[in-house]
């Protein structure tokens, strides 16, 4: 798993960054866990990063992710309800220069090294549909969320609002 110090070292550099001309409104480091309190961890294997969903041993350090929050204007002609709306979007970076990406073709969530401006696949619309949990909807594929499948992160299609509360797309953020 990544050491936390490496992430913290580069948060200051990110504060000065501009992604597609927009700066994040706020950033912070948090560990990511599932609704059932399994941890999201990241490991370097064969020169690429793997993402796991697992139970941590007692006193094992949780991996931290840098969440950068962006405000996105949604014009009224797109919103369908006659008002300009704002959404919160996030990018998630567990280590320097690597971001979570939605691979819509493979229905997978991957870590990619990339330079700014980040592609749309790295942006996720933030939902809090459940008390103190969040969900991440693909910017590039509305209705598709980051979810848990077979101890990995995957992209999961949510076909109705009733399923927005399904546990496998709910995540907890913790700064401890």
């Amino acid at each position: 798993a990544f050491g936390i110090s490496g992430v913290q070292k580069y948060t200051r550099a990110l504060h000065d960054s501009s992604i597609t001309g927009i700066s994040p409104i706020t950033e912070y480091l948090a560990s990511l866990s599932t609704y059932n309190d399994q941890s999201i961890t990241f490991a370097l294997e064969d020169e690429s990063y793997e993402i796991y969903v697992e139970d941590l041993k007692k006193d094992e350090k949780k991996d931290k992710v840098l969440l950068s929050y962006y405000e996105s204007q949604h014009p009224s002609n797109e919103s369908g309800d006659g008002v300009d709306g704002k959404m919160l979007m996030v990018t998630l970076s567990p280590t320097k220069d690597f971001w979570l990406h939605a691979n819509n073709k493979e229905h997978s969530v991957e870590l990619h090294k990339c330079e700014k401006p980040l592609p749309d696949q790295a942006f996720f619309v933030l939902h809090n549909m459940h008390s103190n949990c969040v969900s991440f909807e693909c910017k590039t594929d509305p209705g598709v969320f980051i979810g848990v499948k077979d101890n990995h992160l995957a992209l999961i299609k949510v076909d109705s609002s009733e399923n927005l509360c399904t546990e496998n797309i709910l995540f907890k953020l913790s700064e401890t």
Partner: antibody, heavy 121, light 106 residues
């Protein structure tokens, strides 16, 4: 134009229940959460609960056993029901809309005018 | 529940002056803090969200700062309509708690 308006009974007898309707216009309940808040001179502003975009509901745990929030999307209405009212439930009850689509992190951008509820025999 | 401690409870100031109100959260809330003002007989009005962002139509003499547990709200060049009550609110986790309010008096 975003608009929220509460309508309530005004006077409620102790141990009876309270029903308030929040009529909304200018936005979609499928995109924005609607919150219920009450205000008393003694306690200030108290958050009661939220009907989130997508229909899920969160309550203030201190009042959860007495509260029920629901909606009629076709009529653009959100409802608050509170049981077993006591005199200290006398307050101005507000509904308010989230600032952001799909999340409450940005606070409440639009509020109704409030409806005064007095609990008295 | 997260407690929000707002201070001072009341403050006197004069037209054209600046004032600062602080809000302390009992645990870290990131940047998820909003500031409202409430005129007598009216509902609260959102001024600042995400700790530092100015809500639509709010004059730039209002500003917010802070993150984590300590937040500040400043009004420059006080106008007559600013002498009302101000509230902070945390939106990090439910229940979304408010501060006790600050009454600004002339």
């Amino acid at each position: 134009q975003v608009h929220l308006k509460e309508s309530g009974p005004g006077l409620v007898a102790p141990s009876q229940s309270l029903s308030i309707t929040c009529n909304v216009s200018g936005f979609s309940l499928s995109k924005y959460g609607v919150h219920w808040i009450r205000q008393t001179p003694g306690r200030g502003l108290d958050w009661l609960g939220v009907l989130r975009a997508g229909g899920t509901i969160s309550y203030n745990s201190a009042l959860m056993s007495r509260l029920s929030i629901s909606e009629d999307i076709s009529k653009s209405q959100v409802f608050l029901k509170m049981n077993d009212l006591q005199t200290d439930d006398s307050a101005i009850y507000f509904c308010a809309r989230d600032h952001y689509y799909y999340s409450s992190f940005g606070g409440f951008a639009s509020w109704g005018q409030g409806t005064l509820v007095t609990v008295s025999a | 529940d997260i407690q929000m401690t707002q201070s001072p409870a009341s403050q006197s100031a004069s037209l054209g002056e600046s004032v600062t109100i602080t809000c302390l959260a009992s645990q870290t809330i990131g940047a998820w803090l909003a500031w409202y003002r409430q005129q007598p007989g009216k509902s609260p009005q959102l001024l600042i969200y995400a700790a530092t962002r100015l809500a639509d139509g709010v004059p730039s003499r209002f500003s917010g700062s802070g993150s984590g547990t300590k937040f500040s709200f400043k009004i420059n060049n006080l106008q007559a309509e600013d002498f009302v009550i101000y509230y902070c609110q945390q939106l990090n986790s439910t229940p979304y708690t408010f501060g006790g309010g600050t009454r600004l008096e002339m």
